[in-house]
Interface confidence: low
């Protein structure tokens, strides 16, 4: 299939940034947002700045997503949630895989069975409710440049 | 009903300026981005340009750039294109279209067009 | 000139299925899952028929369907109706966060 434009980061050298994108969520068309308290949700508005965010290859198919404007990382907790953090600890590590249907996936890196996720009115999954297939978990990466 | 009023087309000469409008009606304007559209005689559909639903975010095909400005006021459920500088090759019925939620580029709702003609 | 290239026309005969291709690049059809096809009647505006490759908005016909591999997007109509004459176009969102049309396809129903 043919991959979404930069969309994977699993051919860049650890700590490569690529240009900022914005993920949007194939689940009810949210782009995911990480506000400057820490909050993650979805949104529909294309240009909100906190959409904005920059995927670091930390390793061979492994990232981590920080919100451009709010200076923050996104971090699974013990618990389920997602929120982002001032700084990048091991909860802020994601696997990200191209799935067949050109949509990516999050999954945590520490809670390997979870996956960064949204539901349709826009609020963000907890971890322990996701699962491979839904279309909760399913992400497009899009360009940022503007 | 949802509904798309363009309005402001006509005959004006190469450089001058034209201000088309668009009303919005049965739907909730200001929840919206817009874009229009532009189809010359007997051609295709050329995008010419997009207003996030705040007005912060636009962008212009090339074509355009520098001599449009998209605009809109929510208040007033009113979408705008100043055109400065028109060319011959600005001829076209111009649409405005609506922005289908979450999505990029797929326009649901469109107006019936209003006609701009560029000659001397 | 078109950015997306289509076929200027097709035909068919009622009850037959027709399919139109939309070639792009990688920076727009192949990169993104944001391909639209819109139904043109003369001295009508388009109307939304596909977007997201393969939704159809409500009130669209099912006999109205997309699909994508690689850098072509293809619409389909089967079971040709009289009324389905009129010209189509695809879009596609860009790398630079534009959108282009296809140069627009005649459909004749024979």
């Known amino acids: 299939p043919a991959l979404p434009e930069d969309g994977g980061s699993g051919a860049f050298p650890p700590g490569h940034f690529k240009d900022p994108k914005r993920l949007y969520c194939k689940n009810g068309g949210f782009f995911l947002r990480i506000h400057p308290d820490g909050r993650v949700d979805g949104v529909r508005e294309k240009s909100d700045p906190h959409i904005k965010l920059q995927l670091q290859a930390e390793e061979r198919g492994v990232v981590s997503i920080k919100g451009v404007c709010a200076n923050r990382y996104l971090a699974m907790k013990e618990d389920g949630r997602l929120l982002a953090s001032k700084c990048v600890t091991d909860e802020c590590f994601f696997f990200e895989r191209l799935e067949s249907n050109n949509y990516n996936t999050y999954r945590s890196r520490k809670y390997t069975s979870w996956y960064v996720a949204l539901k349709r009115t826009g609020q963000y999954k907890l971890g322990s409710k996701t699962g491979p297939g839904q279309k909760a978990i399913l992400f497009l990466p899009m360009s940022a440049k503007s | 009903q949802v509904q798309l009023q363009e309005s402001g087309g006509g005959l004006v000469q190469p450089g001058g300026s034209l201000r088309l409008s668009c009303a919005a009606s049965g739907f909730t304007f200001s929840s919206y981005e817009m874009n229009w559209v532009r189809q010359a005689p007997g051609k295709g559909l050329e995008w010419v340009s997009y207003i996030s639903s705040s007005g912060s975010t636009i962008y212009y095909a090339d074509s355009v750039k520098g001599r449009f400005t998209i605009s809109r006021d929510n208040a007033k459920n009113s979408l705008y294109l100043q055109m400065n500088s028109l060319r011959a090759e600005d001829t076209a019925v111009y649409y405005c279209a609506r922005e289908l939620t979450g999505d990029w580029g797929a326009f649901d709702i469109w107006g019936q067009g209003t006609m701009v003609t560029v000659s001397s | 000139q078109s950015v997306l290239t289509q076929p200027a026309s097709v035909s068919g005969s009622p009850g037959q299925s027709i399919t139109i291709s939309c070639t792009g690049t990688s920076s727009d059809v192949g990169g993104y899952n944001y391909v639209s096809w819109y139904q043109q009647h003369p001295g009508k505006a388009p109307k939304l028929m596909i977007y997201?490759?393969?939704n159809r908005p409500s009130g669209v016909s099912n006999r109205f369907s997309g699909s994508k591999s690689g850098n072509t997007a293809s619409l389909t109509i089967s079971g040709l109706q009289a009324e389905d004459e009129a010209d189509y176009y695809c879009s596609s969102y860009t790398s630079s966060s534009t959108v282009v049309f296809g140069g627009g396809t005649k459909l004749t129903v024979l």
């Open positions: 997201d490759v393969s």
